[in-house]
């Protein structure tokens, strides 16, 4: 026995209060499939949400976020506050990225700079809060005959080559020592920060709302939750 409601198309509902007739969806409601016994209430884009697509009798409204906010979640169920490049959103608002991290977008979290030495490369351009470091060619790339594109260099006397090699090795050693020193320094600082957290605590700065930006670097502990500083749910 066929259900009489199966004949009702999208944009209508099977009104079992009126002998199963197909009635059009009332204002501010829709049915995206046929055979429905009721229509769904249209989504309303209010407050920080704005209407991207109006509701019709067969499809729901779609929302996005007002300027200064971006969508989060399926179908833009939340609007989260934008931050500047070089910042991330924390519970206390926008905070600058810590030294050694960057964020090149208005959303998301600060990510660590690329460690060029892990790929055996050198730092060509230093990182900033907004940009990652640019890694340069590795020492092997600089060695003679490594590049097939570079035309062969004119022959030099053996003494000159030895000088160049000595200089290159000295520079490489100095760079490696510097990297080791910096790594050790970071480890010691991290240890001191864990051991004596009160030394590094930021003085409390009162905010006038989630939208206010903070000058202090975010430097989140691993257990601190990300986001949650300026989210608005529909």
């Amino acid at each position: 026995l066929q259900d009489p409601c199966s004949n009702c198309p999208a944009g209508t509902f099977c009104d079992n209060n009126r002998n199963q007739i197909c009635s059009p969806c009332p204002p501010n409601s829709f049915s995206s499939a046929g055979g429905q016994r009721t229509c769904d209430i249209c989504r309303q884009c209010k407050g920080v949400f704005r209407t991207r697509k109006e509701c019709s009798s067969t499809s729901n409204a779609e929302c996005d976020c007002t300027p200064g906010f971006h969508c989060l979640g399926a179908g833009c169920s939340m609007c989260e506050q934008d931050c500047k490049q070089g910042q991330e959103l924390t519970k206390k608002g926008c905070k600058d990225c810590c030294f050694g991290t960057f964020n090149d977008q208005k959303r998301g979290i600060c990510r660590p700079w690329t460690n060029c030495s892990l790929d055996g490369k050198s730092v060509l351009v230093n990182g900033t809060k907004e940009r990652d470091v640019v890694c340069g060619p590795s020492p092997a790339d600089l060695s003679p005959g490594a590049s097939s594109v570079t035309p062969p260099a004119p022959a030099r006397e053996p003494g000159h080559s030895l000088q160049v090699l000595t200089l290159f090795l000295a520079l490489t050693s100095a760079l490696l020592l510097a990297l080791i020193f910096i790594t050790l320094l970071f480890s010691v600082l991290k240890w001191i920060r864990k051991k004596f957290p009160h030394i590094f605590k930021q003085p409390f700065k009162k905010t006038t709302g989630a939208a206010q930006e903070e000058d202090a670097c975010s430097c989140r502990c691993p257990q601190e939750e990300e986001g949650g500083g300026g989210g608005y749910e529909l």
Epitope: F13, C14, D15, N16, N17, R18, S23, P26, S29, Q36, R37, T38, C39
Partner: antibody, heavy 119, light 107 residues
Amino acid sequence: QVQLQQPGAELVRPGASVKLSCKASGYIFTSYWINWVKQRPGQGLEWIGNIYPSDSYTNYNQKFKDKATLTVDKSSSTAYMQLSSPTSEDSAVYYCTRFHYGSSPFDNWGQGTTLTVSS
Amino acid sequence: DIQMTQSTSSLSASLGDRVTISCRASQDISHYLNWYQQKPDGTVKLLIYYTSRLHSGVPSRFSGSGSGTDYSLTISNLEQEDFATYFCQQGHTLPRTFGGGTKLEIK
């Protein structure tokens, strides 16, 4: 804010018909169906019927077809249910409740009127 | 008429418990199942409609599930105000019919 206001109690003599009222406010009265539901002491809920105020279209539960008559007064946004020849079996709490259309749920309920049929 | 059966007429639980109330329809009702709460003073409120959709203002500790003929209401982390009677109701076919109710009592 949506409200369905019902008198708290009504006393009626057996055999004398009674008209229960339900005054709606806080929404467009003509856009929602008004339903009536019966609950006998310590028992479950029974749907009596509904009426669409816009055109007074009604549906009745067969069990109450000869007992209840549903009407509305659009000017005062009030729905009525008249019970004919009441007996002690009709002593119960009567709720008015609304839904939008189709198979929508009863999203707002009145406080209920306790009807006592007694001589 | 579609018969709605709530097999458990009363249920005892403690604060913080998770309870599930079941409801069975005599035929497939295609998810058109609503849940209501009735307080001891007689006040009735809609909790969940179309099987699992939370009515506005209802706490998220209430949830609904089911399909075909079998449906359930779950209350997680019971609070004092949740001790009441719960009714299921089908919106698939006229006449609208209700389950007999499940009274949730404090242990």
